[in-house]
Amino acid sequence: TPEVWVQVRMEATELSSFTIRCGFLGSGSISLVTVSWGGPNGAGGTTLAVLHPERGIRQWAPARQARWETQSSISLILEGSGASSPCANTTFCCKFASFPEGSWEACGSLPPSSDPGLSAPPTPAPILRAD
């Protein structure tokens, strides 16, 4: 069964800066990745970035840099201030559309006790939806 993992890291040097890493553990070909915060995309979450392997990348503030790390994982740097700044308990979600598995989504956030510069381990997060 395919799985999605999500890792959230707060940068020690910039407390309003977060790095989100997501990966897809499956054998299919990824056709689209959507990163959102505040909940799953389409269920109250706000889209931060969309990554298409053959068309490119689209991102929205406070996303600063979205990129593919490998054929099956992506990273996103968030930088915000004021109302657009993420906070420590913000939930970030990643949805991978893959052929032939379909769409798989998981969410993650910083553990409550995380110190700046630490991150949640990149273990597979609970799969919220498989379309």
Partner: nanobody
Framework: EVQLVESGGGLVQPGGSLRLSCAAS????????MGWYRQAPGKDRELVAT???????KYVDSVKGRFTISRGDAKNSLYLQMNSLRAEDTAVYFC????????????WGQGTMVTVSS
Amino acid sequence: EVQLVESGGGLVQPGGSLRLSCAASETYFDLYVMGWYRQAPGKDRELVATITYTGSIKYVDSVKGRFTISRGDAKNSLYLQMNSLRAEDTAVYFCNADPSGLGRKVYWGQGTMVTVSS
């Protein structure tokens, strides 16, 4: 399919300047890496310069200090300012785009000819 169209090539004297432009049909997504390659007659295609959508730039040593790559205000527009041109810069210049940066799908323009000759 992303379409790339180059323009700006031509005949220029040694020491002269040209500005190449490349327009991409993709206007929703940012193309992660765009670049310029060139192919001189009888030679292999070689990298000239690349730029990511976040502004990271690389040049081949032979053009450093003479050529400047940039991306325009219009999404996925690409430029190459070529100064102090030399005869060895004569080639067909191709615009290239790698939307993911991973090489999974790479697009090429049809090329524009640059001739440096007196």
